[in-house]
């Protein structure tokens, strides 16, 4: 479950005289290249991240799915530490993500893509708790647009992260991670799961269909998505031009 080592060396960031705290700090000191960088958030050991540099500054890619090459049905420790291939499908790791965001509110961007090639970009203002809160995700501002309102918890409600071996979901009668698949901020199981099983075609059996990658308010509950990317950026003032 370890994050694979990158083929390319991380870019040179000599201007800082230390490792950058995150992708946003890299952008703020003038880095405009996307790719793999070694960062070191406050109080954390160094680790590699995928940065995407945009007009909103530097984003850290925390999840990517597009071909089913990586098994996402993993236990708590794997979701905590991270797994996969930084050049392909991966989950960065909850502890790493939390070390990047710290106590700050953050922007979470989610790109969804269906099998017809249609894409939707969602953005949320969120707060991610530490392991003591089971990495609870809390919406800290109203959701932009019509999408997402029923897909993520209402503003203010915190949803813990759950895996099959650590059930923190909001359902008393079932373990969402077991009945679905993968680890996620499950809530009541039915709203979304971007870490589900990868399906190349729509399974006929509903029980299998439920285990897929879905985002209820976009293509419908249990429509198996073709690709997803999740990016995070700690909030401060907007990045300097």
């Amino acid at each position: 479950p370890e994050m694979a080592q990158p083929v390319d060396p991380a870019h040179n960031v000599s201007r800082l005289h230390r490792l950058p705290r995150d992708c946003q700090e890299l952008f703020q000191v003038g880095e405009r290249q996307s790719g793999l960088f070694e960062i070191q958030p406050q109080g954390s050991p160094p680790f590699l991240v995928n940065c995407k540099m945009t007009s909103d500054g530097g984003w850290t890619v925390i999840q990517r799915r597009h071909d089913g090459s990586v098994d996402f049905n993993r236990p708590w420790e794997a979701y905590k530490a991270g797994f996969g291939d930084p050049h392909g499908e991966f989950w960065l790791g909850l502890e790493k993500v939390h070390s990047i965001t710290g106590d700050r509110n953050s922007r979470l961007a989610v790109q969804l893509r269906d099998w017809d090639g249609n894409a939707e970009l969602l953005q949320f203002s969120v707060h991610l708790g530490g392991e003591d809160t089971a990495y609870s995700l809390q919406l800290t501002a109203p959701v932009a647009g019509q999408l997402g309102a029923t897909t993520v918890p209402p503003s203010g409600l915190s949803v813990p992260f759950s895996t099959w071996d650590q059930d923190h979901d909001l359902r008393r009668d079932k373990n969402c991670a077991k009945s679905l698949s993968g680890g996620w901020w499950f809530g009541t199981c039915s709203h979304s799961n971007l870490n589900g099983q990868y399906f190349r075609s729509i399974p006929q059996q509903r029980q299998k269909l439920k285990k897929g990658i879905f985002w209820k308010t976009w293509r419908g509950r249990y429509y198996p998505l073709q690709a997803t990317t999740m990016l995070i950026q700690p909030m401060a003032a907007e990045a300097a031009s």
Partner: antibody, heavy 118, light 107 residues
Framework: EVQLVESGGGLVQPGRSLKLSCAAS????????MAWVRQTPTKGLEWVAS????????YYRDSVKGRFTISRDNAKNTQYLQMDSLRSEDTATYYC???????????WGQGVMVTVSS | DIQMTQSPSFLSASVGDRVTINCKAS??????LNWYQQKLGEAPKRLIY???NLQTGIPSRFSGSGSGTDFTLTISSLQPEDFATYCC?????????FGGGTKLELK
């Protein structure tokens, strides 16, 4: 359906100003960065300016810095390009483009012609 | 700044031909390369995003490949409606740079 519609182009004398608009529909405008790209027969396509989702960050190609201003009004689903001190080399078709973050420019407007000539 | 060198600038081909257009970056750009098609008087239309992903509604005769600095757009069997100008865009380095374009003409 995603739609970007530019307006405001035309013929203008060197040194004068022009303001382009781009009306967006069919998507949640405030979730996307936006940009202006221009095209000439000699130089082809070239990026002109970009603006962040909230409008607080703006970026310009060197040749237009200090003369052009990109802005947006998320309530009106519209982005703008204020072009001052226009030069003959600014003559081009100007396109509005949507920046989808992960895979960059995915949708473009139909373009608007700007001609700077005396 | 990353320079994108596109070749050839002009290409003559016949209906049914297999055609390849190349884009070379002055440094590595990961997979962040898009291909666009533009017809006279129209806006650029994205064909391929991030090296090899086909955009919605684009026929499967279009494909993209490459890595590092060298990228290719392939049209497996040219159709009459494919005669147009093609352009690449790298977005590994913000705010991105375009190739010079390839005008595909009927032989």
């Amino acid at each position: 359906e995603v739609q970007l519609v530019e307006s405001g182009g035309g013929l203008v004398q060197p040194g004068r100003s022009l303001k382009l608009s781009c009306a967006a529909s069919g998507f949640t405008f405030s979730n996307y960065g936006m940009a202006w790209v221009r095209q000439t027969p000699t130089k082809g396509l070239e990026w002109v300016a970009s603006i962040s989702t909230g409008g607080g960050n703006t970026y310009y190609r060197d040749s237009v810095k200090g003369r052009f201003t990109i802005s947006r009004d998320n309530a009106k689903n519209t982005q703008y390009l204020q072009m001052d001190s226009l030069r003959s080399e600014d003559t081009a078709t100007y396109y509005c483009a949507r920046d989808s973050t992960v895979d960059y420019f995915d949708y473009w407007g139909q373009g608007v012609m700007v001609t700077v000539s005396s | 700044d990353i320079q994108m060198t596109q070749s050839p600038s002009f290409l003559s081909a016949s209906v049914g031909d297999r055609v390849t257009i190349n884009c070379k970056a002055s440094q590595k750009i990961n997979k962040y390369l898009n291909w666009y098609q533009q017809k006279l008087g129209e806006a650029p239309k994205r064909l391929i995003y991030n090296t090899n992903n086909l955009q919605t509604g684009i026929p499967s005769r279009f494909s993209g490949s490459g890595s590092g600095t060298d990228f290719t757009l392939t049209i497996s069997s040219l159709q009459p409606e494919d005669f147009a100008t093609y352009c690449c865009l790298q977005h590994n380095s913000f705010p991105g740079t375009f190739g010079g374009g390839t005008k595909l003409e009927l032989k």
